[in-house]
Interface confidence: low
């Protein structure tokens, strides 16, 4: 489909005469009839197979024809056709004199013809005008012509239909040859396929509009390249959806059991060394001068009561210093300058001379000790801590630091081996004299019920439509990861296609 356009530019009839040579009265009121037809080697009368068009009176005798296309006028003249342009044509242009206002052929006298030209040849579709001039004895006509395609028609013959669109059925404009040119963000034969966000995972992501990345079930992230781990997975990752692979230092089905308490919580204080000893269990090895479960207590060097004979101990940065009572000297006030005459024995102690009075010894009553009976008896000397517990003096009181497996004020209570819940997968724990024993539930075995003996839930191939099956170790059931287009616990239901028109 296209249009043959003819632009009349100038007509010269200086003498104002008809083809017969007779002059027009008062002048030749000139209009044109145009006939477009198929190519003829010799242009002959007959049907105008490609179309005809007539003009109104355009001027008298000689005149220039105004380009009237912008004002909705009739120059250039339009000869539309709704077939493939053959590339060749014949054109007849007749100039007629109109004595009155009726321009119909039957209303004109037969000798009203001023001139007639006929041309034929090849003409390719294109925007460029071909300029031509035809001269007869008495007249001259200058004109130009071209063939262009109608809207939405393209190609060398105006035979390719292409209508630009930007809707559900395509997003494109048309190239000069009629081929589609996709709008930015669209691809495919009909430009219906959106170009997803750059990097969007080919299998795990998709999009319904350009620069989008929507994730299929089991995947997440901006580019849908991160799998979604099992629901409840705390400190774990996955390489395929619904897995839960524990990070370093974590255990349990959902990676929620801390196997590296030392690293994650740093419980040991004052530069102590931490050793993991099981789930949420650790041991601190204290540096000299510190004590307590977490080495949080600072040991005073005076705690060992190094000053003798009632000397008072003072802590110093680099150790300690003894302030000796009168009559004593030395690092620990161990040397005496006293005799029994000086009544050196405290708390009712009795004095005994030694070395001819140069020295003495105090005999202390119960609950007192020291070279001058100056110290109350250490409460730890009776070793009140049972089961190898370590006794620590704390001023007027004492405390027992128990070995693993024991508790209580004096470490007298035996901690049940079962208190740590050592039996996995719901096994029942029994305390024995020299250890423990686990009774395992169905599907598990081993000393701690750690070995799974149940049948793989995916073995029966429960998932439909080529879905991927994963065993949920926490419930001994399966999870189906559906391919695109299917839903349901077994991927048994196809997703409804757009409800209106499924093709």
């Amino acid at each position: 489909s296209g249009v043959f356009q003819l632009q009349l530019q100038e007509f010269i009839n200086e003498r104002g005469v008809l083809a017969s040579g007779r002059p027009c009265e008062p002048g030749c009121r000139t209009f044109f009839r145009v006939c477009l037809k198929h190519f003829q080697a010799v242009v002959s009368p007959g049907p105008c197979t490609f179309g005809t068009v007539s003009t109104p009176v355009l001027g008298t005798n000689s005149f220039a024809v105004r380009d009237d296309s912008s004002g909705g006028g009739r120059n250039p003249l339009q000869l539309p056709f709704n077939f493939t342009w053959p590339g060749t044509f014949s054109l007849i242009i007749e100039a007629w004199h109109a004595p009155g206002d009726d321009l119909r052929p039957e209303a004109l006298p037969p000798d009203a013809l001023i001139s007639k030209i006929a041309i034929q040849g090849s003409l390719a579709v294109g925007q460029n005008w071909l300029l031509d001039e035809q001269t007869s004895t008495l007249t001259r006509l200058r004109y130009s012509y071209r063939v262009i395609c109608s809207d939405n028609y393209y190609g060398d013959n105006c035979s390719r239909l292409c209508k630009k669109r930007n809707d559900h059925f395509g997003h494109y404009v048309c190239q000069p040859d009629g081929n589609l040119s996709c709008l930015p963000g669209w691809t495919g034969e009909y430009c219906q396929q959106p170009i997803c966000l750059s990097g969007c995972h080919e299998q795990n992501g998709y999009c319904s509009k350009p620069a989008e990345c929507l994730c299929r079930p089991g995947w997440q992230g901006r580019l849908c390249n991160e799998c979604i781990p099992h629901n409840g997975c705390r400190h774990g990752t996955c390489s395929t959806p619904w897995q839960c692979t524990c990070d370093e230092g974590w255990g349990g089905l959902f990676c929620d059991q801390d196997l590296n308490y030392c690293t994650h919580h740093s419980p040991c204080k004052n530069g102590a060394t931490c050793s993991n000893s099981g789930q949420r269990s650790y041991t601190c090895t204290c540096r000299p001068g510190y004590t307590g479960v977490d080495c949080e207590l600072e040991l005073s060097e005076c705690d060992s009561n190094p000053c003798r004979n009632g000397g008072s101990c003072k802590d110093q940065e680099d150790g300690y210093h003894c302030l000796c009572p009168p009559g004593y000297y030395g690092l620990h006030c161990e040397h005496s300058t006293l005799s029994c005459a000086d009544s050196p024995c405290f708390n009712g102690g009795s004095c005994r001379e030694r070395n001819q009075g140069a020295n003495y010894a105090c005999e202390c009553p119960p609950n007192f000790t020291g070279s001058n009976c100056e110290k109350k008896v250490d409460r730890c000397t009776s070793n009140p801590c049972a089961n190898g517990g370590q006794c620590l003096n704390r001023g007027p009181s004492r405390m027992c630091r128990c070995r693993p497996g024991f508790t209580g004020t004096y470490c007298e209570l035996h901690v049940s081996d079962c208190a740590r819940n050592p039996c996995a997968h719901g096994g029942t724990c029994h305390d024995l004299e020299n250890g423990l024993m686990c009774t395992c539930p169905a599907g598990f075995s081993g000393r701690r019920c750690e070995v799974r003996t149940s049948i793989d839930a995916c073995a029966s191939s429960p998932c439909f439509n080529r879905a991927t099956c994963y065993t949920d170790l926490s419930t001994d059931t399966f999870v189906c990861n559906c391919p695109y287009g299917f839903v349901g616990s077994r991927c048994e239901f196809p997703v409804g296609l757009p409800p209106s028109f499924p093709w």
Epitope: S159, L161, K163, R165, H168, F169, G170, E189, Y190, Q192, S500, F501, W503
Partner: nanobody, 120 residues
């Protein structure tokens, strides 16, 4: 202007046959895919069949697969829907439609429809 005119509908008994025709005009027939959809009273439209511009690709809804056949005749600018083993649930207005492209992907133009009634 694109025009699609359906014909061939009517009343038929269950198990009977009908042949619907869709005559196209206003566009180059060989360029567009053409199909059929139907709509029963109070129901959503249902796309039932389509044939690509070249005729090499055909589509059928599960509800008509094996009973209906679509074909096209470029010389007559016509698409046919041969309906066999008709059931009462096939009762609907049948519309001829085209997506306005060569592939069967959607609907852009459609006709006035022809009534098909399957009843004893």
């Amino acid at each position: 202007e694109v025009q699609l005119v359906e014909s061939g509908g009517g009343l038929v008994q269950p198990g009977g046959s009908l042949r619907l025709s869709c005559t196209a005009s206003g566009f180059t027939f060989d360029v567009y895919a053409i199909g059929w959809f139907r709509q029963a009273p109070g129901k959503e439209p249902e796309g039932i069949s389509c044939i690509s511009s070249s005729g090499s690709i055909t589509y059928y809804a599960d509800s008509v697969k094996g009973r209906f056949t679509i074909s096209r005749d470029s010389a007559k600018n016509t698409v046919y829907l041969q309906m066999n083993s008709l059931k009462p649930e096939d009762t609907a207005v049948y519309y001829c439609a085209t997506p306005g492209i060569a592939a069967c992907r959607g609907i852009h133009y459609w006709g006035q429809g022809t009534q098909v009634t399957v009843s004893s």
